[in-house]
Interface confidence: low
């Protein structure tokens, strides 16, 4: 015999208390597949989370993060605060990248500048706390007088952030 509950579509549940009639999901709940015996409670986007997609009877709410934060984890299970480019998030908040490192995003950690000499290349553009160095041709490729490359400006020291 076919399970009568299998006829209940998404957005409903098979109500055992009412002779297995398909009842609509109550407010703030959903069922994304047919044949469900219960509806799941909708996710609530509270605090640092904000609603990206409202809950419907057939699909859960989706959250993202309030301004100044970004999602982490599957389905935006966590919000982590943004830093500015040139910074990384530490336990004490956003801190400038140390000299010799950079971060070109609002998340993640500061990473060391590329060491051009490891590839036998020269530094074409010096790095900053927001940008990696740009490696140019190897020094041997630059015969005297043939170079159109201007000498790189001194690397910018990380700026001070009043904290």
């Amino acid at each position: 015999l076919q399970d009568p509950c299998s006829n209940c579509p998404a957005g409903t549940f098979c109500d055992n208390n009412r002779n297995q009639i398909c009842s609509p999901c109550p407010p703030n709940s959903f069922s994304s597949a047919g044949g469900q015996r219960t509806c799941d409670i909708c996710r609530q986007c509270k605090g640092v989370f904000r609603t990206r997609k409202e809950c419907s009877s057939t699909s859960n709410a989706e959250c993202d993060c309030t301004p100044g934060f970004h999602c982490l984890g599957a389905g935006c299970s966590m919000c982590e605060q943004d830093c500015k480019q040139g910074q990384e998030l530490t336990k004490k908040g956003c801190k400038d990248c140390c000299f010799g490192t950079f971060n070109d995003q609002k998340r993640g950690i500061c990473r060391p500048w590329t060491n051009c000499s490891l590839d036998g290349k020269s530094v074409l553009v010096n790095g900053t706390k927001e940008r990696d160095v740009v490696c140019g041709p190897s020094p041997a490729d630059l015969s005297p007088g043939a170079s159109s490359v201007t000498p790189p400006a001194p690397a910018r020291e990380p700026g001070h952030s009043p904290q």
Partner: antibody
């Protein structure tokens, strides 16, 4: 020594605009956000918005949307706040303030610019 | 917008008293709350951020606590220089919003 120095007091007529300046010294404004907060006589503090001097992006409180414009001149480390269509209830002291967004918000303040709107 | 309801709006107290000021957010604000002190004719001064982290130089008699929607600033033993107006601020979301302020007066 981190410091924010604001422009002097202004007296304006209703309907006019005011442009207050805020000059930073002792730090790189591109590493911070600059906020503007106002305080009407005998009243509390009201956040108007902020600008990221690194790129000029700004966020404004809905209440001031369309009337306020925040700009910056990185060459002089100065941020500006322009408020248009002034009315008497805009009479207030306008403060610029700075601080890393999440670490210690608004920890350095200018001395304030007094704006009086009167016919 | 997130509303910040601060109470009491004013309080009279004596030197040496313990004073508690509360701030209630209209929705959870995680730990994105700070406290400011303002004296007449002066710009506000940041005392505490992220609920309970004191700024360097702020005396140990000031402390902050709370989470979610309910937050408290406590001054354990009032000193003459503490008589001022205190404001809470939420900075979880735009627009950032201040509480209405608590004026701390000498009894």
């Amino acid at each position: 020594q981190e410091q924010l120095v604001q422009s002097g007091a202004e007296v304006k007529k209703p309907g006019a605009s005011v442009k207050a300046s805020c000059k930073a010294s002792g730090f790189n404004i591109q590493d911070t956000y600059i906020h503007w907060v106002r305080q009407a006589p005998g009243q509390g503090l009201e956040w108007m918005g902020r600008i990221d001097p690194a790129n000029g992006n700004s966020e404004y409180a809905q209440k001031f949307q369309g009337r306020v414009t925040m700009t910056r001149d990185t060459s002089t480390s100065t941020v500006y706040m322009e408020l248009s269509s002034l009315r008497s209830e805009d009479t207030a002291v306008y403060y610029c303030t700075t601080g890393n967004l999440h670490y210690a918000l608004m920890d350095y303040w200018g001395q304030g610019t007094s704006v009086t709107v009167s016919s | 917008d997130i509303q910040m309801t601060q109470s009491p709006s004013s309080v009279s107290a004596s030197v040496g008293d313990r004073v508690t000021i509360t701030c209630k957010a209209s929705q959870p604000i995680n730990t994105y709350l700070s406290w400011y002190q303002q004296k007449p004719g002066k710009a506000p001064k940041l005392l505490i951020y992220r609920v309970n982290r004191k700024v360097d130089g702020v005396p140990s008699r000031f402390s902050g606590s709370g989470s979610g929607t309910d937050f408290t600033l406590t001054i354990s033993s009032l000193q003459p220089e503490d008589f001022a107006t205190y404001y809470c601020l939420q900075y979880l979301d735009f627009p950032y919003t201040f509480g209405g302020g608590t004026k701390l007066e000498i009894k």
